[in-house]
């Protein structure tokens, strides 16, 4: 079947990094500079993404893969493939349309991005507060009040290795 298909469509033989050039009798031609084709059998090459301004190049474009951008210091990526760069704020702040704003009492943000979130209400999950919340940290919930007998230790667990928002998109 593959042989029949390639006899019918010579373009299917063109590998990634090339395109099927109709102007040259459907010969496989290399992608021109600043363009790429990530799959075989393509009739055109795609223009490479250019990382300009607040974007910076994380991975250069090659003949078989597009460039990848991230953001300059003080900004972070948003959207699929880092389609936007958004201003960082400090922990304990959130970005509003008017700029960075401190979290109100009872809310926190442990990242340089995202919103100020209400502290977890431990009692709603049948637990008690082990460590109070701050603008930068959520409360730490522990066992239910009934489980805490005199002399029971209240040890703050280690912070998670990565909070939501810190993983690459």
């Amino acid at each position: 079947f593959e042989r029949t298909r390639s006899l019918q469509d010579p373009c299917s033989n063109c590998p990634a990094g090339t395109f099927c050039d109709n102007n040259r009798n459907q010969i496989c031609s290399p992608c021109p500079p600043n363009s790429f084709s990530s799959a075989g059998g393509q009739r055109t090459c795609d223009i490479c993404r250019q990382c300009k301004g607040v974007f910076r190049t994380r991975k250069e474009c090659s003949s078989t893969s597009n460039a990848e951008c991230d953001c300059t210091p003080g900004f972070h990526c948003l959207g699929a493939g880092c389609s936007m760069c958004e201003q960082d704020c400090k922990q304990g702040q959130e970005l509003t349309k008017k700029g960075c704003k401190d979290c109100c009492f009872g809310t926190f943000n442990d990242q340089k991005r995202g919103i100020c979130r209400p502290w977890t209400n431990c009692s709603l999950d049948g637990k008690s507060v082990l460590v109070n919340g701050t603008k930068e940290r959520d409360v730490v919930c522990g066992p239910s009040p009934a489980d805490l007998s005199p002399g029971a230790s209240s040890v703050t667990p280690p912070a998670p290795a990565r909070e939501p928002g810190h993983s690459p998109q």
């Epitope: 948003l78 919103i115 977890t120 709603l124 990565r162 993983s167």
Partner: antibody
Framework: QMQLVQSGAEVKKPGASVKVSCKAS????????MHWVRQAPGQGLEWMGW????????NYAQKFQGRVTITRDTSASTAYMELSSLRSEDTAVYYC?????????????WGQGTLVTVSS | SYELTQPPSVSVAPGKTARITCGGN??????VHWYQQKPGQAPVLVIY???DRPSGIPERFSGSNSGNTATLTISRVEAGDEADYYC?????????FGGGTQLTVL
Amino acid sequence: QMQLVQSGAEVKKPGASVKVSCKASGYSFGGYYMHWVRQAPGQGLEWMGWVNPNSGGTNYAQKFQGRVTITRDTSASTAYMELSSLRSEDTAVYYCAREGYGLGLDLDVWGQGTLVTVSS
Amino acid sequence: SYELTQPPSVSVAPGKTARITCGGNNIGSKSVHWYQQKPGQAPVLVIYYDSDRPSGIPERFSGSNSGNTATLTISRVEAGDEADYYCQVWDSSSVVFGGGTQLTVL
């Protein structure tokens, strides 16, 4: 690709509890808050709450406080929503949805939904 | 608590432009997200942060937000755009959805 797969349909009696699961794949489970949203037949979307997949911290809509518990199992990349003291008005499709990033709060990946029917 | 108001239904002829509004007190200060939901399916994010499109969403979908009204605009409407559309914001401690608008393509 990024996917949220929910547990199957449930039929419950009034007063009972239901626990719906939501298994994440194709992305770092620990990197994104997980939300639960429900939709009664012929009605709009109603937010129930979220869980922080790392700390287990939660936030619930006032309407559901005391009746809903959202948890997670990071080793299984799975979030759970348990609703207790069920009544007929809780008959709905329950969705889990992953939170995106940044200014505001968008839900960029949704599960297929789980129909919970409450009937005597 | 914060409320979002949408018209229950909007009708439009194929190829024309549909505008779906979402009203809320000073909504222009918030980030608005829009979802499309077809019968029997889960919602799909079509606009986020007022006017940005996720990958895979056609350029025909656009959004704007100022004052007390956010608007989802669908240009060159197609039969496949027929669905319910919901706006959504974050307000201090909860996620708030509009009541939804049923878009009918005539």
